[in-house]
């Protein structure tokens, strides 16, 4: 399979920090027009999940094999399908990532489902925000199935897909009826082209038996390994924080692969990195579990410990997936050759030993470089080993050097030397630098020169208003990135300080020197004027306005429109949160009402001068009801309606709307348009036999008018013909053009 990984950073509290990165481990990937073939492509795929247009996303290439997509401005930008395409020629491969809104009405229990041909796939949408409406399932954007809202089981709507075939693959969604599509649960179903454990054109070949959650590719029989595993059968774990087919890539940032979703070529799909799980990949594996999405169980034997990234870590003397295979046993077990601690910490050091006779607590000691001997404070005795725990006094720099763990029993002695490095936490030597400032945010370069030891694992930025006694606000940032302090007060001085940390307990250094940074916020001075407006319906008004042309950038965050209904003494406000907007659609207004209208520019919480007011009259509501509605059954499936036009019409009728409902039925009514308003009769077809129906209708001019009286009529029984002039009803039918 092509070595192509799509990483999604799931720090969802701030869409502006969200990014997608596509990384290729292929030789020469992405170099463009030279001999290495086409570049990596990373894009949002709007064919199935469409989101409102926003500012264009920014694509940045980092070297020849990495491309990153940024520039998401609001959470809805993130919802949908993203794809990365890499590899050359026949190896050109598309990797797909599906992003769900964490605030959606429905959330997928599991986004990616990889199943074998002929299996049953079960998609489960969990109710997050309940609505008492039906749930529509779609496949690749097209209607697929409806579930009544009562059919939820244990807070979940399930879609069972029996005997799936490869054409069933694609994007599935579950949406409450009449809810925003952005609130849907989106799923990706991948159907392998063969049954379980098989691959090849006729599915005749046997898969190699992929380990650690790897998935056998149905075309070439290779294992697509989960992130964090390598080898032809995914038998080998990468070091923590590494991924790629040869473990050659490293997770960005200070928390390793936490918060990252990894998407790999089909049929693997997407998962968290090794050691992480949860909808946002922010939860570490529970004890005893490891691997991508923590799907694997350790079941270590003989004192093996479960590492959530690699599985069983065996003590000396044992090996195998579950540490079930015996070695020759040395007496000191599992002693690291080098340990690192931070200055002034009081670490615990463990030393494990086995032997015959069995070591007890007093028989294991720890010797410092200056010759001081420490006795263990606690020992854990297990059938196959004793682990002595040593509480080390507060470390000083002189404690750096070679330490020794020694075990002595009547059966002899063993010792193991290991190196201890005592590191000094970093302290900034300078204040952070202000890069840019706005009314509500400051962009700061946090990484400064420092004393002490690296590497820098965490940068904390502490800030609060100048002269304030309130608590410092703290933001933890990636050492390599500039940081934006958001939601600040306009025109306010902030004291900003940096604190650096290095890895390990006690790695936090002292705070650096403070600096004063001040936010901006000029008052908006421009007075808009109302260019015009037009009525888009009896309750809808489209308003447009202009601003004077002045040099330089526009000072403003958006516009405040006010509508005053003097008759009722009521005001309506509309916020337009874009300073570029010059038009707005006001809906839900009262037909036949005089409104006074004005518009103001705002910046932060400051308002500019209001425009001169305008006076708008909305037209009254729609036409009166049609008269003398009558229903007559024609057959077991047809009923003819006749009526008279409404009186005193304010204008020409554009259409009639007929409402059809089964009498006593609980379902939603059906609405049928009669698009030829000169008609005074129509035939409703496709009805059920021997069934009582209710009908009513209304006319539309600019808006929908009042309903007519309701009439009741039953279709005839099966096999019975309607009495009356069948020829006339047919002629009427032809003239209706339904």
């Amino acid at each position: 399979a092509v070595d192509l990984t799509l990483l999604a950073n799931l720090r969802l509290t701030d869409p502006q920090r969200f990014f997608l990165t596509c990384v290729s481990g292929e030789a020469g990937a992405g170099r463009g027009s030279d001999a290495w073939g086409p570049p990596l492509l990373l894009e949002k795929d709007d064919r199935i999940v469409r989101t409102p247009p926003g500012p264009p996303l920014r694509l940045a290439r980092n070297g020849s094999h990495q491309v990153t997509l940024r520039g998401f401005s609001k959470p809805s930008d993130l919802v949908g399908v993203f794809s990365c395409v890499g590899g050359a020629g026949a190896r050109r491969t598309r990797v797909i990532y599906v992003h769900n809104s964490p605030g959606a009405h429905l959330l997928p229990d599991k986004v990616t489902h990889t199943v074998n041909k002929g299996d049953t796939a079960v998609l489960s949408a969990r109710v997050h925000k309940e609505k008492q409406t039906d749930v529509i399932w779609k496949s690749n954007g097209s209607y697929f199935y409806t579930l009544d809202w009562h059919e939820a089981q244990d807070g979940r709507f399930l879609l069972q897909l029996p005997n799936v075939q490869p054409p069933s693959s694609g994007i599935y969604s579950a949406t409450y009826l009449e809810a925003s599509p952005l609130g849907s649960a989106f799923f990706r179903l991948i159907v392998r082209g063969c049954g379980a454990g098989r691959w090849g054109p006729g599915c005749t070949k046997e898969c190699p038996g992929c380990l650690h959650g790897g998935v056998c590719h149905d075309h070439d029989g290779e294992c697509v390994c989960p992130p964090g595993f390598t080898g032809t059968r995914c038998e080998q774990a990468c070091r923590e924080g590494r991924f790629g087919q040869s473990c050659q890539e490293q997770c960005p940032g200070i928390s390793g692969c936490r918060g990252l979703t990894f998407c790999l070529p089909d049929p693997y799909g997407c998962s968290c990195g090794s050691g992480w799980r949860g909808s946002q990949c922010q939860e570490a594996c529970a004890p005893g579990h490891f691997g991508a999405d923590c799907r694997l169980q350790c079941q270590c034997q003989n004192g093996g410990t479960c590492d959530r990234f690699s599985g069983c870590v065996c003590p000396s003397g044992w090996h195998g997936v579950h540490c079930e295979k015996s070695d020759r046993i040395p007496q000191i077990l599992n002693m690291a050759s080098e340990l690192e601690f931070n200055l002034e910490t009081m670490p615990r050091i463990n030393c494990a030993a086995a032997g015959n006779p069995f070591p007890v607590r007093g028989s294991i000691e720890l010797r410092k470089p200056d010759g001081t001997v420490l006795l263990s404070t606690k020992a854990i005795v297990e059938p196959e080993k004793t682990t002595a725990e040593f509480e080390v006094p507060r470390l000083v720099l002189a404690d750096s050097g070679f330490w020794e763990c020694r075990v002595s029993t009547s059966g002899g002695q063993d010792s193991r030397r290991f190196k201890v490095n005592v590191k000094v936490p970093p302290v900034p030597l300078a204040a952070p630098r202000l890069l840019t400032k706005q009314s509500r945010q400051l962009v700061v370069s946090p990484l400064v020169s420092f004393s002490g030891d690296g590497p820098i694992s965490t940068v904390r930025l502490h800030y609060r208003p100048q002269d304030s006694t309130m608590d410092w606000s703290t933001i933890v940032v990636d050492p390599s990135e500039n940081v934006t302090l958001m939601n600040l007060r306009p025109k306010t001085g902030y004291s900003v300080r940096v604190q650096l940390s290095r890895p390990g307990e006690g790695g936090e250094g002292a705070w650096g020197p403070p600096t004063l940074m001040t936010t901006d916020c000029p008052e908006p001075l421009l007075q808009p004027w109302l260019e015009g407006w037009h009525v888009e319906g009896t309750d809808r008004l489209r308003v447009s306005w202009s601003l004077p042309l002045v040099p330089g950038p526009l000072v403003g965050d958006g516009f405040l429109l006010r509508l005053w209904d003097g008759t009722r003494g009521q005001e309506r406000r509309e916020n337009v949160s874009s300073p570029q907007a010059r038009t707005a659609l006001l809906t839900g207004l009262t037909p036949g009402t005089h409104y006074q209208l004005d518009v103001q520019l705002y910046h932060c919480t400051l308002l500019g001068p209001a425009s001169p007011p305008a006076h708008v009259l909305l037209p009254p509501s729609g036409p009166p009801a049609p008269r003398h509605l009558h229903a007559q059954a024609l057959s077991d499936s047809e009923i003819q309606l006749t009526w008279k036009h409404p009186e005193a019409l304010p204008g020409p009728i554009s259409k009639y709307v007929v409402e059809v409902q089964v009498a006593g039925g609980a379902g939603d009514p059906l609405w049928i348009d009669v698009d030829r308003p000169e008609e005074t009769s129509t035939i409703i077809r496709g009805l059920n036999a021997s069934t009582r129906y209710l009908f009513r209708m209304r006319a539309s001019i600019q808006g929908l008018g009042d309903w007519s009286n309701t009439v009741e009529e039953s279709t005839l029984g099966n096999g019975l013909q309607a009495e009356g002039p069948v020829q006339e009803s047919r002629a009427a039918e032809e003239g209706l053009d339904q």
């Epitope: 009521q570 005001e571 006074q596 705002y602 308002l607 209001a610 007011p613």
Partner: antibody, heavy 118, light 111 residues
Framework: EVQLLESGGGLVQPGGSLRLSCAAS????????MSWVRQAPGKGLEWVSY????????YYADSVKGRFTISRDNSKNTLYLQMNSLRAEDTAVYYC???????????WGQGTTVTVSS | DIQMTQSPLSLPVTPGEPASISCRSS???????????LDWYLQKPGQSPQLLIY???NRASGVPDRFSGSGSGTDFTLKISRVEAEDVGVYYC????????FGQGTKVEIK
């Protein structure tokens, strides 16, 4: 710094009148809508009246309609509430409040006390 | 008119612990422009009310980030992640979609 300072409260008999003032400073008064909100002793907040930046449209809670009049003098940066036909149930602390684009009552004054009693 | 209902009406709290106040409106406060027209105010003892949260979930200037607003439509919540002694007072929700209407208030006091 935005400041709102109410004055004019006091003790008045039922049926009497009182005029409250709110002096504004630290912002361009003529750009902002203004409101009066009151709080009866030991009770919650009740919106009373509202006025446009231009002094144009005004509106009132049903409980004071026809008895209270809100007005403003943008040249003096001052908001007024003329209260006539006062009743015992009008006894409250009266606050003036400035709106902004996002909130009706973004900034509040310290309040002035009106007591209606015989 | 839109009616606002808060719960609980009294909330004893422990400093350092989280606290949560609920507010329900008799009709949806979600406007077609995507904003929820609901504000939260705090009135500390002997002081004027102050704006905490506007448009459902936006912290007003100078409000500590331990305060957060959430919810949409008719159900809203004000959360304090770690209560401090200075947070005592009466908290009001208010709908601003129509004629302004306040909730009854929730009195927060230290246990």
């Amino acid at each position: 710094e935005v400041q709102l300072l109410e004055s004019g409260g006091g003790l008045v008999q039922p049926g009497g009148s009182l005029r409250l003032s709110c002096a504004a400073s630290g912002f361009t008064f003529s750009h902002y809508d203004m409101s009066w909100v009151r709080q009866a002793p030991g009770k919650g907040l009740e919106w009373v009246s509202y006025i446009y930046p231009s002094g144009g449209p005004t509106y009132y809670a049903d409980s004071v309609k026809g008895r209270f009049t809100i007005s403003r003098d943008n040249s003096k940066n001052t908001l007024y509430l003329q209260m006539n036909s006062l009743r015992a149930e009008d006894t409250a602390v009266y606050y003036c409040a400035r709106g902004d684009w996002a909130s009706r009552f973004a900034t509040w004054g310290q309040g002035t006390t009106v007591t209606v009693s015989s | 008119d839109i009616q606002m209902t808060q719960s609980p009406l009294s909330l004893p709290v422990t400093p350092g612990e989280p606290a949560s106040i609920s507010c329900r409106s008799s009709q949806s406060l979600l406007h077609s422009n995507g904003y929820n027209y609901l504000d939260w105010y705090l009135q500390k003892p002997g002081q004027s009310p102050q704006l905490l949260i506007y448009l459902g979930s936006n912290r007003a200037s100078g409000v500590p980030d331990r305060f957060s607003g959430s919810g949409s439509g008719t159900d809203f919540t004000l959360k304090i992640s770690r209560v401090e002694a200075e947070d005592v007072g009466v908290y009001y929700c208010m709908q601003a979609l129509q004629t302004p209407q306040f909730g009854q208030g929730t009195k927060v006091e230290i246990k």
